[in-house]
């Protein structure tokens, strides 16, 4: 007897996971036989479509390789033209391991702005996004957050947040991971410590402290009124992101020096600047007690000019007493360059003598000083004309007067030859003949403002200037 | 490199004159910019300077002791001598020798190893 | 007569940064120097014109002098530096003057 199609087997929700199979089964009892029919979203699926089998005269219905976009209500149709056709639906819903869609990337970003790490997900249930970083979970706060679409956060980014990164994508069926990715927090230069700003004798050596930081790590510049230092070592060393930059000058001139931290952040840079002065004390007489030690000269400047088995005073004044004579009596010879033939080598040797003074034998190290008339046989002979010019210089400012009082003795103040022969040097290199004193410029009109005392002549030397003038 | 070295009577009476010399080797006693000086310590004590022979034969000597004290030298030897009377009991000490370099700032950059006297009866 | 005064007795753990001082009017104008003495022998010098080392002694030891107080400092010290460190100088009337001395412990 013919019998109307009854569905026997309701179709049922069915879970299925990607690229897994999934079949739907719908039971029908009628005669004669029903034509079954199926469709997704009340689409027909058709017989010829490959990615489904129909089997059973229909009755079973099986997704070959199930995709994410196979989920949906899926319903069978029975009709055999007795009574009305029947139908059953189910779902199928498509399960899926989380997935991460758009993974982060590394990112490079400024103290103080806002970073965003990417982490776009997919995945059924709904997959929980979490993030690593370094070894350790990351915990959210108020300024790190994770977004619903399971981006990263971090306002305000502070140096500690620099580190290693991967979101973690978890649901009921699996766990994914992103690979690693780099945040680098970059910070504009920051001086942490200024150079200090000193009142020094001329002379002296003095050391220049700059300290910044930033990431990448700063460089540091010298700049000296406005121009890149050209004198003085520079010592720098980095620790710990910090880089201490120390200036050591040797101080003849007052100026500006200033400390430039630059560091460089994609296209653009990051400057910060301390300025520190130096300016130079009006220098004041040795103590009553010399300080210092006793060494053979190991310079250059002097090196004709002083006697080849003396040894040399080195005040301890001075943190590097070699360095700092010879360039003290450096800076006084470049100015002798335009001074006489007759008076160079006169003024040389008085130089070298006066700075690097011999040292007494004695028990304790003492510097013996330039007789005071070999000083005024420079001063008032030699080089009449050039330290009259000199002084009429100095009181006009045009000099740094710090300088000449270091490298030009005070003849008056100088102990004479007459008094005790021992208690002052001679200047063996003053040892003209007669015959030079034609060359010599003529003498100033003015009468030496010394009395230059009679110096008693020598068969040891050739050098005799005058009736009044004999040097030993 | 000089080298110094003391001797003389370990054992000295009181009120007698206590006698060391110091014989210096690798370097001469009238070399410029070298000094020679006396040094004693005391046991248990703190080292005292006693006074010097410069290159040249002048002499200085401690306050607390200028009174007593003597030293003297024989270049032809290459010795320098100390010469301390009226010796007491505190006069026990180690006695070194020393040589004062300016290149040191006359610090005393050689020493003899010491040697000891003691004062008693 | 110059008075020197040095403190009898200064601990420092090993490795650890010693300072022993010398006390004396004005010392800051004059050359001190500083002598290392370990019992049974002779005192050696390790530091001159206040802070020039001589050579053979380590860098560690270095020196400073100033207003009344000269400073004796050892970087790190190490066991064999346990010793009595006396300081030196000169007066302008050509005498010497030591310190009493300061018996460095190295714990």
């Known amino acids: 007897l013919p019998k109307a199609p009854v569905i026997t087997t309701p179709l049922e929700t069915v879970d299925a996971l990607v690229e897994e199979v999934a079949t739907f089964m719908c039971a029908v009892e009628s005669y004669p036989q029903p034509e079954i029919s199926w469709t997704r979203n009340k689409i027909l699926i058709k017989l010829f479509d490959t990615r489904y089998s129909i089997r059973e005269n229909g009755q079973l219905l099986t997704i070959l390789s199930v995709e994410d976009s196979d989920d949906g209500i899926y319903c069978c149709t029975a009709n055999n033209g007795v009574g009305g056709a029947v139908e059953s639906c189910g779902a199928l819903q498509v399960k899926m391991k989380p997935k991460i869609t758009r993974p982060p990337i590394n990112v490079k970003i400024i103290e103080g702005l806002k970073a965003v790490l990417p982490c776009t997900t997919m995945g059924n249930p709904k997959p929980s996004v979490s993030w690593i970083k370094g070894d350790s979970p990351l915990r959210e706060n108020s300024r790190i957050a994770v977004l619903e679409s399971g981006s990263l956060r971090i306002h305000n980014v502070q140096k500690e947040d620099a580190g290693q990164y991967r979101c973690v994508a978890k649901n009921s069926l699996g766990t994914a991971y992103s690979k690693v990715v780099k945040l680098e927090v970059e910070v504009f230069a920051r001086i942490l410590r200024a150079p200090e700003s000193h009142n020094v004798t001329f002379g002296s050596f003095v050391t220049l402290h700059c300290t910044a930081t930033g990431i990448p790590v700063p460089t540091i510049t010298w700049i000296e009124n406005g121009n890149a230092v050209s004198s003085g070592s520079i010592q720098e060393s980095v620790k710990d992101r910090v880089i201490d930059s120390r200036l050591q000058l040797f101080i003849t001139k007052p100026g500006l020096y200033t400390c430039i931290a630059t560091n460089k952040h994609g296209e653009k840079f990051s400057t910060a600047k301390a300025a520190a002065t130096i300016s130079i004390a009006e220098w004041s007489k040795p103590q009553k007690d010399n300080k210092g030690y006793c060494a053979q000269y190991r310079g250059e400047v002097c090196n004709a000019v002083l006697a080849k088995d003396a040894l040399v005073f080195l005040n301890t004044s001075y943190a590097d007493p070699e360095e700092a004579q010879e360039l003290l009596v450096h800076t006084a010879w470049n100015e002798l360059k335009v001074v006489s033939p007759v008076c160079r080598p006169a003024a040389e040797a008085l130089l070298c003598n006066h700075i690097f003074q011999e040292c007494s034998p004695g028990v304790v190290p003492t510097p013996i000083p330039i007789c005071r008339e070999y000083c005024l046989a420079v001063k008032e002979l030699f080089c009449a004309k050039e330290w009259l010019v000199m002084e009429e210089k100095t009181h006009r400012g045009l000099y740094r007067s710090e300088m000449h009082l270091l490298s030009v003795p005070e003849c008056s103040k100088l102990p004479s030859m007459h008094w005790d022969p021992t208690a002052c040097a001679r200047l063996p290199h003053l040892d003209y003949n007669k015959e030079n004193l034609k060359t010599f410029p003529p003498m100033t009109s003015s009468k030496p403002s010394v009395d230059i005392p009679n110096l008693p002549s020598s068969s040891s030397s050739s050098f005799s200037v005058s009736p009044t003038y004999s040097m030993t | 490199q000089v080298q110094v070295q003391e001797s003389g009577p370990g054992l000295v009476k009181p009120s007698q004159t206590l006698s060391l010399t110091c014989t210096v080797s690798?370097?001469?006693?009238?070399?410029?910019?070298?000094?020679w000086s006396w040094i004693r310590q005391p046991p248990g004590k703190g080292l005292e300077w006693m006074g010097v022979i410069a290159y040249d034969g002048s002499t200085y000597y401690s306050p607390s002791l200028k009174s007593r004290t003597s030293i003297s030298r024989d270049t032809s030897k290459n010795q320098f001598s100390l010469h301390l009377s009226s010796v007491t009991p505190d006069d026990t000490a180690v006695y070194y020798c020393?040589?004062?370099?300016?290149?040191?700032?006359?610090?005393?950059?050689?020493w003899g190893q010491g040697t000891q006297v003691t004062v008693s009866s | 007569s110059y008075e020197l005064t040095q403190s009898p007795s200064v601990s420092v753990a090993l490795r650890r940064t010693a300072k022993i001082t010398c006390g004396g009017d004005?010392?800051?104008?004059?050359?001190t120097q500083w002598y290392q003495q370990k019992p049974g022998q002779a005192p050696v010098l390790v530091i001159y014109?206040?802070?020039r080392r001589p050579s053979g002694i380590p860098e560690r030891f270095s020196g400073s002098n100033s207003g009344n107080t000269a400073t004796l400092t050892i970087s790190g010290a190490q066991a064999e530096d346990e010793a009595d460190y006396y300081c030196?100088?000169?007066?302008?009337?050509?005498?010497?003057?030591f310190g009493g001395g300061t018996h460095l412990t190295v714990l």
């Open positions: 004005n010392i800051g104008s004059k050359n």
């Open positions: 014109a206040d802070s």
């Open positions: 690798g370097g001469s006693i009238t070399a410029r910019y070298y000094s």
């Open positions: 020393a040589r004062g370099s300016s290149r040191v700032a006359a610090a005393f950059d050689s």
């Open positions: 030196h100088v000169w007066d302008s009337s050509t005498n010497a003057w």
